[in-house]
């Protein structure tokens, strides 16, 4: 007899989720020598333990602590890149600028990037049919709590000058409700972080405005300054050329107009 299953508003767990997480873990530990000591089966067990058999609207950061402990990693000072609503460009950047890191360049972020998962209360099954939607169902769902947990940790461990890439095409360039605005900003440690430098990415040649003067950026500056962290802002008028110059920094055209 088919068992009744809670119907959520969001899409279900990504197909082959356990295999994907395990395979990503193995690949990551092979490529990153400093993480070779990590036992991927233990990582999967800890990941699974955070949400399996638990009501998917009642997940806590505590549930993910065993996983966070196993995935402990440090980023060198001045090498943390945060982002908000502009993931693709941030990742293209760190793929070229290999000594800078987004959360998704770290083990735990890499494991979960673009995946969805949830379980069911009192069963060992993974729900491939539907998972809670943050808006329509609940915010304390397995995916949202995971990203809140690892984002908090990522921000807490950052040091030196931290960079953040922001999408200048959005109506709210800095959004207090984004993961960056609600979690990361508030967990940068003033005793370790000297400055936050925002890179506001322009959407196209049509926009000649100084988006660093945008009211939401001024709001970000205010929040950061109140936390005794210095704030700087740069317009990236030409993201296409920005990436090109990361690849070829010696070209004379990359040194001009700064």
């Amino acid at each position: 007899v088919p068992r009744w299953r809670q119907q959520w508003s969001g899409s279900g767990t990504t197909s082959r989720f356990p295999e994907t997480v395990l395979a990503r873990c193995v690949k990551y530990t092979e490529v990153h020598p400093e993480m070779r000591h990590v036992d991927c089966q233990s990582v999967w067990d800890a990941f699974k333990g955070a949400f399996i058999s638990k009501y998917p609207c009642n997940i806590t950061e505590e549930d993910y602590q065993p996983l966070v402990k196993l995935g402990t990693q440090t980023v060198p000072c001045n090498k943390t890149l945060l982002w908000s609503r502009i993931k693709d460009l941030a990742h293209q950047f760190t793929q070229v600028q290999r000594d800078m890191f987004t959360l998704e360049d770290m083990l735990l972020g890499y494991l979960a990037d673009d995946l969805t998962w949830c379980g069911e209360f009192n069963t060992f099954e993974i729900n491939y049919q539907s998972c809670p939607d943050w808006r329509k169902d609940c915010s304390n769902n397995p995916v949202s709590v995971f990203w809140k947990t690892v984002s908090r940790r990522f921000a807490e461990t950052a040091c030196g000058v931290v960079h953040v890439m922001l999408n200048g095409s959005r109506s709210k360039i800095f959004d207090k409700n984004s993961t960056f605005g609600s979690v990361e900003v508030h967990n940068l440690q003033p005793e370790k972080v000297q400055a936050l430098e925002a890179w506001v990415i322009h959407g196209g040649r049509e926009d000649s405005r100084d988006l660093c003067q945008d009211p939401t950026i001024k709001e970000l500056e205010s929040i950061i300054s109140k936390r005794n962290i210095r704030f700087f802002c740069k317009n990236i008028y030409r993201p296409d050329k920005f990436l090109q110059c990361v690849k070829n920094p010696e070209d004379s055209s990359c040194l001009s107009g700064i």
Partner: antibody
Framework: EVQLLESGGGLVQPGGSLRLSCAAS????????MSWVRQAPGKGLEWVST????????YYADSVKGRFTISRDNSKNTLYLQMNSLRAEDTAVYYC????????????????WGQGTLVTVSS | EIVMTQSPATLSVSPGERATLSCRAS??????LAWYQQKPGQAPRLLIY???TRATGIPARFSGSGSGTEFTLTISSLQSEDFAVYYC?????????FGQGTKVEIK
């Protein structure tokens, strides 16, 4: 030394077509947006079209939209302007010009210009 | 589109004197304005960008000022090689537009 050399101008009948070329040297062509600017005899300057670094975006003056096509071949360091359905009012010297294409500050002006090629549309 | 209006159309100045050229935009262009010099039979040459920044190799006697809608190009002491036509251009909004030019001639 930055050099821009236009070619392809000449006499063409109304309704005809012409393809202008601009050979660039002395700089990394693929790192710059490029434009065409024209000047009718005895008149002022008029911006015609701009193409971004990799040709991903193109912009046109309303007076040429739908008739002219700007393109580039970064492997040949060459900018092109395909002109169709030419009219008498398109008669002008056509200049190829480079935009500084800064990352951290806005640009949209022209720091280097070619010597121009004359296009005459007449029957 | 933004209309750029230059004045005067012609300016008669003696060598060694100061020349002041004006450019007005029909709406604000912030500081996104350039000035060019063009001599007969030659391509234009960039003088000023960002309303006030001199381009590479441009003598200090050329200076630009203004922001928003009102801009000025000043040539502090005219040399013989400065007699030419001067154009302003806005690059704040598409389409980019030029003024009609000011001819600086020998008095």
């Amino acid at each position: 030394e930055v050099q821009l050399l236009e070619s392809g101008g000449g006499l063409v009948q109304p309704g005809g077509s012409l393809r202008l070329s601009c050979a660039a040297s002395g700089f990394t062509f693929s790192f710059y947006d490029m434009s065409w600017v024209r000047q009718a005899p005895g008149k002022g300057l008029e911006w015609v079209s701009t193409i971004t670094l990799h040709g991903g975006d193109t912009y046109y003056a309303d007076s040429v939209k739908g008739r002219f096509t700007i393109s580039r071949d970064n492997s040949k360091n060459t900018l092109y302007l395909q002109m169709n359905s030419l009219r008498a009012e398109d008669t002008a010297v056509y200049y190829c010009a480079r935009d500084p294409s800064y990352i951290y500050s806005t640009s949209g002006y022209f720091d280097y210009w070619g010597q121009g090629t004359l296009v005459t549309v007449s029957s | 589109e933004i209309v750029m209006t230059q004045s005067p159309a012609t300016l008669s100045v003696s060598p060694g004197e100061r020349a002041t050229l004006s450019c007005r935009a029909s709406q604000s262009v912030s500081s996104n304005l350039a000035w060019y010099q063009q001599k007969p039979g030659q391509a234009p040459r960039l003088l000023i960008y960002g309303a006030s920044t001199r381009a590479t190799g441009i003598p200090a006697r050329f200076s630009g000022s203004g922001s928003g809608t009102e801009f000025t190009l000043t040539i502090s002491s005219l040399q013989s090689e400065d007699f030419a036509v001067y154009y302003c251009q806005q690059y704040n909004n598409w389409p980019w537009t030029f003024g009609q030019g000011t001819k600086v001639e020998i008095k």
